[in-house]
């Protein structure tokens, strides 16, 4: 019957994905038992995305590669609500790479997934960005203004945040 075949397909997908993410945490979306949305364990979920806080210290380029081999990218922050969710899982004494860089040092900031950079939805600390040689963005905590973005040198190792679309099975 229909439900049996749906379950068989779901198990097949789970097996296929298992070599990349050994454990998935899934929830039923809405009332329809057909739709399960999943994030790898122990990633966190918000709206239609999954997030992973990488505590290994790496350069910006290596951090992005680390995310991409997992099927993700360094985080692209689209709304204040999304940033408010992300910071719940961050440590105040750490800095984390975002998927935001200015490769030419000309203040042409670009998101790694080609999402258009919108000046109206940015959360730079006051006075930032402030150095043309600092071409990668981090999010960190400043006691005076809480969480915000700062430009830093891309080769300086930092923690990072990966983001990917939820996995639907």
């Amino acid at each position: 019957n229909f439900m049996y075949s749906k379950t068989v397909k779901r198990l097949s997908k789970l097996r296929e994905y298992q070599q990349y993410h050994p454990s998935l945490t899934c929830v039923m979306e809405g009332k329809d038992i057909e739709d399960w949305s999943c994030c790898p364990t122990p990633w966190t979920s918000f709206q239609s995305s999954c997030y992973f806080i990488s505590t290994g210290m790496q350069s910006w380029t290596k951090s992005q590669k680390n995310c991409s081999v997992m099927g993700a990218d360094l985080v692209v922050i689209n709304t204040r609500e999304e940033q408010d969710f992300i910071i719940q899982n961050l440590k105040r004494n750490s800095s984390y790479f975002l998927g935001l860089s200015d490769p030419g040092g000309r203040r042409h900031w670009q998101w790694v997934d080609q999402t258009p950079y919108n000046e109206n939805v940015t959360f730079w600390h006051s006075g930032e960005p402030n150095n043309l040689d600092e071409r990668c963005a981090i999010i960190n905590f400043r006691s005076s203004e809480e969480w915000g973005w700062n430009d830093i040198h891309c080769h300086v190792p930092q923690k990072s945040i990966c983001k990917m679309k939820k996995i639907y099975i």
Epitope: Y20, K65, V112, D113
Partner: nanobody, 127 residues
């Protein structure tokens, strides 16, 4: 670990066609979205075309739309770039790239979104 090998490049006249191939090994090809990029002498590498892992979605840079077609055969672990009406400005080294994805329909246009790259194949278009 994924390995990629491009082939099919060469020297052609303006207006001619070429078909580039990208052979993949080392993992389940159908789990990877694919992109083609190119780098002309003295220029940065640029996005050319992308295809989702199922092959259902494609994306092209404006200057090749209507002339280039990206495709894939998941059974053969291969991707292709059919290039028609070639122009001198298409002269470059062409690279294929793969990235793991769990979406069957998403394409990726950012160079840094692809961790796996081939060595490239030279395409030269003379006028």
């Amino acid at each position: 670990q994924v390995q990629l090998q491009e082939s099919g490049g060469g020297l052609v006249q303006a207006g001619d066609s070429l078909r580039l191939s990208c052979a993949a090994s080392g993992d389940t090809f159908s789990m990877y979205a694919m992109g083609w990029f190119r780098q002309a002498p003295g220029k940065e590498r640029e996005f050319v075309a992308a295809i989702s892992r199922s092959g259902s979605s494609t994306n092209y840079r404006d200057s090749v739309k209507g002339r280039f077609t990206i495709s894939r055969d998941n059974d053969l672990n291969a991707g292709y770039l059919q290039m028609n009406s070639l122009k001198p400005e298409d002269t470059a080294v062409y690279y294929c790239a793969l990235r793991l994805t769990f979406s069957t329909t998403t394409t990726y246009t950012g160079e840094l979104q692809y961790p796996y790259w081939g060595q490239g194949t030279q395409v030269t278009v003379s006028s």
